[in-house]
Interface confidence: medium
């Protein structure tokens, strides 16, 4: 687009006539306070499109913008727009007039407004001051927009000199007004009901002094009317709520409850759903897989949890091997059920420093009027292994004997290794593996029993070493799933006379 | 040269999971035992876990348990942790260390920072 | 699980000085017992292992002494270099470290 004369601004006498032209690619119109003006418009040889405007007889009521615009496209690129601002000095025309709404500034948040006293003449010195007041007030003006700033709820004028007359503006009031961002909040005494029961819910605006409230909810669609109820919490900063109560709820009333608020200052509005389902009856169902098989390290806490959904609320009890188990004045046994949303519960039993007695079957069921589920898993206490004894002897057959005895849950895996250079091992000379089948300088002879009654592995391992001709430095290394130990014996040959 | 180098620290948010990794060479590195130590800054070292030479054991620290995971891949000479559910109290330098069966850690990484922070 | 106290936590010595950091586990560990050291900045390296041993390349003014226990770790004379942060480790059950004992320059 292009304007001749381009401005952006220009002085113009009054009484005067001026000819603006523009010109683009495709048929423009000149506007002015969102109006078209009565104006020329033209197509070229080139496929070029013009449109002219004549300004007859100016006075200073023509001061203002006009734009440039390609036809009904309403700038929709920065470039299909150009603005041009006329000031046309006018000693009979003191301050533009305004539009009555233009009086009154309404604000919601502290933000800087324009208060928009204009004048006709760019060379005057306009003053802005409190209705009441004559100093005037540190606040930058432009002449084509008026003073712009932050402002206190107050009332406010404009001044100049026109000549030797001191000319004053209508007054400008600024209101600040309790009006936020709408934020809704919906909540519902539950979500889940069975028929028969109530459905309550509330809709809840902070911070606005007027707001409107719609629901929409299944009833509505098939034309039952419910009449919610408004109220205010608090005075202040405006808590408004509006109930939705259905007395004895239906399975048809299952679904979507959202609560619409408008308030008129902004034109803001919000809504929030929240879905309510009506069950036949109620229910629980186990959520997540508890193996059937669990463990729990002997001396540590061990804490097992059932994960469910139910409602209404249920009761709750544990077993093991088919008796009740309830909080032990000892603090041994820890049971609590947490209701963890609404109708999702976690049920934990603690075992506090778990003892080789508290292996077992364990049982959760969970219960009400409606319905019931129950869960069943094996405890295994697992106890790391420690080496209780590493001996070795002498048999008269000439080897030579060590012998190790240890105990674990699960069962220990037993590993023999040796070093024959005892200073340099075992940084430089790694440990060498003994008891395998090949080697005949030894032999392993391993044996396993589990004690009922401590419920653990009991291993003893004997190696029986051919020749040894030097001292030799014999570990035996039990490990298991929980834990490793280790021992160290060191084996000298029968001729020598020291351990 | 015998070395281990460190890889996959960074920043991470409560919660969220992050997989470090260690190479390894100048060694056999499927005939040794292999562990992650960390140090919280300003902080003593803690040992977090180990996996034996053929990944057929692995313990882990009461602190990381069931929220991080040690592995080794032998054939590419790599040990790897993966951290997740990751806490505030994790954030420190992860070093990996070689320790034989019943021996001393003789060999360390550089280490690698994990900062857990929202 | 088994704890390793080390004493003292924070030493001021200066070069030439002969000095002992102790630790002693809350259960006897044999002589399954590690003593490293650490720079600002930087990785642990293995000093002495089985609480005695000598770790290969490291200066002989260090050495190891100690069995179930009380152990201790002794500088014969300290060097410029030795001002780090010294930890033990027993290995016997599982793996723990002491807290530390940072050498200071006097």
């Known amino acids: 687009l292009v304007i001749t004369p381009p401005g952006p601004e220009l002085i113009l006498n009054v009484s005067s006539t001026f000819v603006l032209t523009c010109s683009g690619s495709a048929p423009v119109v000149w506007e002015r306070m969102s109006q078209e003006l009565p104006q020329e418009m033209a197509k070229a040889q080139d496929n070029t499109f013009s449109s002219v405007l004549t300004l007859t007889n100016l006075t200073g009521l023509d001061t203002g913008e006009y734009f440039c615009t390609y036809n009904d496209s309403r700038g929709l690129e920065p470039d299909e727009r150009k603005r041009l601002y006329i000031f046309v000095p006018d000693p009979t025309v003191g301050f533009l007039p305004n539009d009555a709404e233009e009086l009154f500034i309404f604000l919601t948040e502290i933000t800087e407004i324009t208060i928009p006293c204009r004048v006709t003449d760019p060379q005057l010195v306009v003053t802005l001051h409190e209705k009441k007041g004559d100093i005037a007030l540190p606040v930058p003006y432009d002449h084509q927009r008026g003073f712009s700033g932050i402002f206190e709820d107050r009332s406010y004028i404009c001044k100049t000199t026109i000549g030797d007359r001191e000319v004053d503006s209508d007054a400008y009031y600024v209101y600040r007004l309790q009006v936020s961002s709408i934020n809704v909040s919906v909540n519902a005494v539950q979500t889940v009901v069975r028929q028969g029961e109530n459905i309550t819910l509330m809709c809840i605006v902070i911070g606005n002094e007027v707001v409107n409230f719609e629901w929409m909810y299944p009833r509505k669609e098939s034309g039952r009317l419910v009449e919610p109820v408004t109220d205010f919490l608090l005075d202040m900063p405006y808590h408004i709520r509006s109930i939705l109560h259905i007395p004895s709820a239906e399975l048809e009333d299952s679904g979507t409850y959202t609560c619409n608020v408008t308030e008129s200052v902004n034109d803001h509005q919000d809504e929030k759903a929240i879905n309510i389902t009506v069950v036949e009856s109620g229910y629980v169902r186990l959520l997540g897989e508890v193996g059937a098989l669990q463990f729990a390290e002997l001396h540590r806490s061990r804490t097992l949890q059932v994960v469910f959904e139910a409602y209404p609320p249920p009761t709750v009890l544990w077993f093991k091997d088919n008796r009740t188990l309830g909080d032990s004045s000892a603090g041994e046994i820890a049971l609590s059920t947490r209701n963890v949303s609404e109708t999702r519960y976690v049920s934990e039993l603690t075992l506090v420093r778990v003892k080789v007695a508290e292996a077992g079957h364990y049982t959760m069921r969970a219960f009400h009027e409606d319905a019931e589920v129950q869960l069943s898993f094996q405890l295994q206490i697992n106890v790391p292994v420690r080496v209780l004894e590493l001996s070795e002897s002498h048999p008269d057959s000439g080897e030579q004997t060590v012998r190790c005895r240890g105990r674990g849950m699960p069962q220990p895996n037993i590993i023999w290794s040796a070093c024959r250079d005892l200073k340099r091992c075992p940084r430089e000379l790694p440990p060498m593996l003994l008891g395998n089948s090949s080697e005949e300088e030894s032999q392993l002879e391993t044996n396993v029993t589990y004690w009922e009654e401590e419920q653990e592995f009991e291993v003893v391992s004997t190696l029986r070493l051919q020749h040894v001709d030097r001292p030799l430095s014999v570990r035996c290394t039990l490990r298991n799933a929980v834990g490793q130990d280790m021992q160290e014996v060191i084996v000298v040959p029968h001729s020598l006379p020291f351990k | 040269e015998v070395q281990l180098v460190e890889s996959g620290g960074g920043v991470v948010q409560p919660g969220r999971s992050l997989r470090l990794s260690c190479a390894a060479s100048?060694?056999?590195?499927?005939?040794?035992?292999m562990h992650w130590v960390r140090q919280a800054p300003g902080k003593g070292l803690e040992w977090v876990t180990v996996i034996w030479y053929d990944g057929s054991y692995k313990y882990y620290a009461d602190s990381v348990k069931g929220r991080f995971t040690i592995s080794r891949d032998n054939s590419k000479n790599r040990l790897y942790l993966q951290m997740n559910s990751l806490r505030a109290e994790d954030t420190a330098v992860y070093y990996c260390?070689?320790?034989?069966?019943?021996?001393?850690?003789?060999?360390w990484g550089q280490g690698t920072m994990v900062t857990v922070s929202s | 699980d088994i704890q390793m106290t080390q004493s003292p936590s924070t030493l001021s010595a200066s070069v030439g000085d002969r000095l002992t950091i102790t630790c002693r586990a809350s259960?006897?560990?044999?002589?399954?017992l590690a003593w490293y050291q650490q720079k600002p900045g930087k990785a642990p390296t293995l000093l002495i292992y089985?609480?005695?041993s000598l770790e290969s390349g490291v200066p002989s003014r260090f050495s190891g002494s100690g069995s179930g226990t009380d152990f201790t770790l002794t500088i014969s004379s300290l060097q410029p270099d030795d001002f780090a942060t010294y930890y033990c480790?027993?290995?016997?059950?599982?793996?723990?470290f002491g807290q530390g004992t940072k050498l200071e320059i006097k």
């Open positions: 260390a070689r320790g034989e069966l019943g021996d001393a850690f003789d060999i």
């Open positions: 480790q027993q290995y016997k059950t599982s793996w723990t």
């Open positions: 089985k609480a005695s």
């Open positions: 259960q006897s560990i044999s002589t399954w």
């Open positions: 100048g060694f056999t590195f499927s005939n040794y035992g």
